[in-house]
Amino acid sequence: VLPRWRQQWSGSGTTSRFPETVLARCVKYTEVHPEMRHVDCQSVWDAFKGAFISKYPCNITEEDYQPLVKLGTQTVPCNKTLLWSRIKDLAHQFTQVQRDMFTLEDMLLGYLADDLTWCGEFNTFEINYQSCPDWRKDCSNNPVSVFWKTVSRRFAETACGVVHVMLNGSRSKIFDKNSTFGSVEVHNLQPEKVQALEAWVIHGGREDSRDLCQDPTIKELESIISKRNIRFFCKNIYRPDKFLQCVKNPEDSSCLSG
C-alpha cells in the first residue's frame, strides 16, 4: 500500500531551487558546447521532471528515465572515456585540463544532476524539499540512485577503444564491487567495442611508493575484465598533484622522464 501522506525519509530533501538549477545548468551547458546548441532545455527539464514527479520515490525504475536518456544522447570519441570511483574531484580536475577526455559529469545529463538530490511524492505534482529516500536506510530504487545507475550504464555501454578509470588508492577497497563503477559500469563495457580498460590508481600519501596495482581488489578487477575479453592495464599515479601539473604542462622538464 502506497502512503498518501507526506513521507518522512531518512535522507536530505530535494536541493533548493532544483528546477531552476537544472534549467540554468542546461542552458550553460549548451552555451559552452556548440554541438549542443540546438537543445531545448525546457524539453530536457520536462523529461527529467516526468521521471520522478507524482511517483512513489522508492519505486523508481530505469524505465522512468528512458525519455530523458533518449533526449540526452551524446557520444564520446573512442579512447576518451574516463570512469572514476571514489575520486570524483581529481577526475574532474583532470578532464578540465585534458579537455578531450570526458567523465559522465562532463556530459549533459551528468552535468545537470551532479551533486544534486531530488524526489517527488506519490500522486502529487510537488517536489519534496523536506526529505528524500536514503539508499541504505530507506530504499535503493530512489530517484537519484536510479538516475545514476541508468546514465552510468548508458555511459559505459557507449564507450569504445581504451577506457580509463581513476581509482582511489587511499581506500581500503581500491576497487569496490559495490560502487557504481564496480556494479554497473564494469559490467556494461562492450567487449566488441572496448579493447582495454586502463586503471589509474591514485596514491594518497606523498611517501607511498607501494605498487597498488598488485592490490587484491585490483587483481579482482583484472579478473572480471579479462573474463569479459577486455584487456586490462594498471598504472600507479604516485603524485596526483604532479600528475595534474604534467597534464597542464607536458613540456615541463620534470615531466619528460618516463
Epitope: 549548451t30 552555451e31 556548440p34 554541438e35 546548441r37 540546438h38 537543445v39 531545448d40 524539453s43 530536457v44 525519455p67 533518449k70 533526449l71 540526452g72 544522447t73
Partner: antibody
Framework: QVQLVESGGGLVKPGGSLRLSCAAS????????MSWIRQAPGKGLEWVAS????????YYADSVRGRFTISRDNAKNSLYLQMNSLRAEDTAVYYC???????????WGQGTLVTVSS | QAGLTQPPSASGTSGQRVTISCSGS????????VYWYQHLPGTAPKLLIY???QRPSGVPDRFSGSKSGNSASLAISGLRSEDEADYYC???????????FGSGTKVTVL
C-alpha cells in the same frame, strides 16, 4: 549588413563535379557555423551540409555524404561546397546560410542553380 | 532522410487565423529547438521563428510559434495577402546529426 553571395552553379553531366562558393560579408565569418541548403524544382528545402567555427567539424545529409565536401576559408570569408559524382537528383538551387548560436539560419544568400543533366 | 511532417496546404480569408502543424520525433522536435521559415518563390528563405517561439526583430507579432512534445505549430493571425508563401519548419535531428526540414505548407489567402 550581412551579405551572402553564392557562385559556381551551372550545368553539369551526371558523374561530373562542381564547386560552389559563398562570399560572406557584414559579420565576423570565423565566429559562425555555416551551411548549405538546397531546393530541388517543385520540392521543399533540404539541408545539405554544415561546418562549425573554430577547428572545423563537418556534418552532412545522408543523401550527399561521401560525395560532397563542405569547407571554409576564414581568411577569405568564404564557404565552399565541392560536389562530386553528381546525380540528376542533385539538381536544385543551392543556398548558403549563416547559422546563429541556437541553430537557426538567420541569413541566406539568393542561391545558385545547379543542373545535372546529360 | 525522414523529414518533419507538415500539411501540404492551408488557407484562410484576409484577417483570419491560420495554424500550420509540424510533427517530428523525440530525436528532433522532442529534444531540440524548432525553427520556422517563410519562402516566397524566387527569393531567399526568411527566418520567422527561432527557439520554438521567438521572433527575430522585424517579424510581425501576427506570427507565433509553439511546441509541445514531438510537435510544433506556427500560427498566423490577421492573415494578409503578403503572407501567401511556403512555410517550413525545421529542427536538428540528434540521430542523423543534421537538420531536418518539414515538407512545406503552401499558405493561400482567399
Amino acid at each position: 549588413q550581412v551579405q551572402l553571395v553564392e557562385s559556381g552553379g551551372g550545368l553539369v553531366k551526371p558523374g561530373g563535379s562542381l564547386r560552389l562558393s559563398c562570399a560572406a560579408s557584414g559579420f565576423t565569418f570565423s565566429d559562425d557555423y555555416m551551411s548549405w541548403i538546397r531546393q530541388a524544382p517543385g520540392k521543399g528545402l533540404e539541408w545539405v551540409a554544415s561546418v562549425s567555427n573554430g577547428r572545423p567539424t563537418t556534418y552532412y545529409a545522408d543523401s550527399v555524404r561521401g560525395r560532397f565536401t563542405i569547407s571554409r576559408d576564414n581568411a577569405k570569408n568564404s564557404l565552399y561546397l565541392q560536389m562530386n559524382s553528381l546525380r540528376a537528383e542533385d539538381t536544385a538551387v543551392y543556398y548558403c546560410a549563416r547559422e546563429a548560436w541556437s541553430g537557426e539560419f538567420t541569413d541566406w544568400g539568393q542561391g545558385t542553380l545547379v543542373t545535372v543533366s546529360s | 532522410q525522414a523529414g518533419l511532417t507538415q500539411p501540404p496546404s492551408a488557407s484562410g480569408t484576409s484577417g483570419q487565423r491560420v495554424t500550420i502543424s509540424c510533427s517530428g520525433s523525440s530525436s528532433n522536435i522532442g529534444i531540440n529547438f524548432v525553427y520556422w521559415y517563410q519562402h516566397l518563390p524566387g527569393t531567399a528563405p526568411k527566418l520567422l521563428i527561432y527557439k520554438n517561439n521567438q521572433r527575430p526583430s522585424g517579424v510581425p507579432d501576427r506570427f507565433s510559434g509553439s511546441k509541445s512534445g514531438n510537435s510544433a505549430s506556427l500560427a498566423i493571425s490577421g492573415l494578409r495577402s503578403e503572407d501567401e508563401a511556403d512555410y517550413y519548419c525545421a529542427a536538428w535531428d540528434d540521430s542523423l546529426s543534421g537538420y531536418v526540414f518539414g515538407s512545406g505548407t503552401k499558405v493561400t489567402v482567399l
